[in-house]
Amino acid sequence: ADSFSLNDALAGSGNPNPQGYPGAWGNQPGAGGYPGAAYPGAYPGQAPPGAYPGQAPPGAYPGQAPPSAYPGPTAPGAYPGPTAPGAYPGQPAPGAFPGQPGAPGAYPQCSGGYPAAGPYGVPAGPLTVPYDLPLPGGVMPRMLITIMGTVKPNANRIVLDFRRGNDVAFHFNPRFNENNRRVIVCNTKQDNNWGKEERQSAFPFESGKPFKIQVLVEADHFKVAVNDAHLLQYNHRMKNLREISQLGISGDITLTSANHAMI
């Protein structure tokens, strides 16, 4: 297959959402997306975020459901209009047509979609990097954090720090050139001490290219997907999740949106 659609990816699976990530594997509608959109939920005139025109995105398996994907939302359907949790006030909620209630078949994935840049390409304006996203009440299982932006040319690093006061519960750090290798390093900092690094050689980021990072909080780990493909999971080293109250985003990126929601 030289083109990718979520319907194709799920064909024959016997499950319309086989543990699918919200907005990544199987939660988008097959039809009946935003009126006038070139692709369900896509920005007008663009390929869908995370998809590469003319080819399947990294980690996509045409004809089957990808592995290790995130659970779908508990209830289908779009938000009926109010801003989704973690989205920016003044923007329509994901799945809601501006000025109308949520349309049937529109994105059902809470704010796992693209709330900061409304569904019709309403410009959010780049967010200042470093950027701190408050996580009021901390994180908890089934919370989904979505970050969208573009990697700068000649990038060196991207950093996500899920912070608990002075500590860093989850440090997610793609490095574009560590001794001429690309690697993703994850770690935790407690009581001024950084722990043992966990390293991942799969590297879905490209200098100069847009990206979407989704972090799903589970009971015993963080699960990370990039550009709609599962990347890694990181076991919790800090158990008091409700105290992880801030996400710091920094590095060599321009940041378009950052939001969170329960799924």
């Epitope: 470093p130 690093r157 950093v159 720090d161 006061g165 002075n166 860093v168 440090h171 750090n173 490095r175 770690n187 900092k189 009581d191 001024n192 001490n193 950084w194 722990g195 043992k196 690094e197 710091g248 920094s250």
Partner: antibody, heavy 120, light 110 residues
Framework: EVQLVESGGSLVKPGGSLRLSCAAS????????MNWVRQAPGKGLEWISS????????YYADFVKGRFTISRDNAKNSLYLQMNSLRAEDTAVYYC?????????????WGRGTLVTVSS | QSVLTQPASVSGSPGQSITISCAGT?????????VAWYQQHPGKAPKLMIY???YRPSGVSNRFSGSKSGNTASLTISGLQAEDEADYYC??????????FGGGTKLEIK
């Protein structure tokens, strides 16, 4: 270019005070922990103090507790060390040092140091 | 007195390998705390050579490697070169959130 430049070192009498400054550039200063490390002439390295990016987490070596105070101003990309009740044994080159998650907390960026001499 | 114990000096010939040890306790090196190694040439600031026990920062030669077993960390330099002649310091976090350094090891290239 990532850079740290210390200033403020000088000759001071025992019992006196001194404030060292460190100007940071080339990285997101507020993201990283910062440290002061010193080295007496002909001796080894000695960690003095560290401060996290938000100034909420501050630690000191026992030998300076109550005499030295570390602080930072993220708006000015600056780190400080206020040294009071100085003693002859505090004579050393004082280094401003970054430690970050990028190096597992290792001290990956060092300034050139500023010399503090405590003598009557 | 330094908390971490290093040999005062080691020597080797060009092309040889040498190992510098760094002995601590269960409150620092042996307590699952990261060990780092620094190189310092005379009159210069130290340079990070190894972090998190065994990782090399970008730009550090792969002739430098680190390891840790129990309460002792080690730095190995293979294929010794003249420019490796310097002082080497180990460092560790500690259980009370402080940092400690070793006393330093002078590496002489014969």
């Amino acid at each position: 270019e990532v850079q740290l430049v210390e200033s403020g070192g000088s000759l001071v009498k025992p019992g006196g005070s001194l404030r060292l400054s460190c100007a940071a550039s080339g990285f997101t200063f507020s993201n990283d922990d910062m440290n002061w490390v010193r080295q007496a002439p002909g001796k080894g390295l000695e960690w003095i103090s560290s401060i996290d990016g938000s100034s909420r987490s501050i630690y000191y070596a026992d030998f300076v507790k109550g005499r030295f105070t570390i602080s930072r101003d993220n708006a000015k990309n600056s780190l400080y060390l206020q040294m009071n009740s100085l003693r002859a044994e505090d004579t050393a080159v004082y280094y401003c040092v970054r430690s970050s998650g990028y190096s597992g907390g290792g001290m990956d960026v060092w300034g050139r140091g500023t010399l503090v001499t405590v003598s009557s | 007195q330094s908390v971490l114990t290093q040999p005062a000096s080691v020597s080797g010939s060009p092309g040889q390998s040498i190992t510098i040890s760094c002995a601590g306790t269960s409150s620092d090196v042996g307590g699952s705390y990261n060990v780092a190694w620094y190189q310092q040439h005379p009159g210069k600031a130290p340079k990070l050579m190894i972090y998190s026990d065994s990782y090399r920062p970008s730009g550090v030669s792969n002739r430098f490697s680190g390891s840790k077993s129990g309460n002792t960390a080690s730095l190995t330099i293979s294929g010794l070169q003249a420019e490796d002649e310097a002082d080497y310091y180990c460092s560790s976090y500690t259980s009370n959130s402080a940092r400690v350094f070793g006393g330093g090891t002078k590496l002489e290239i014969k």
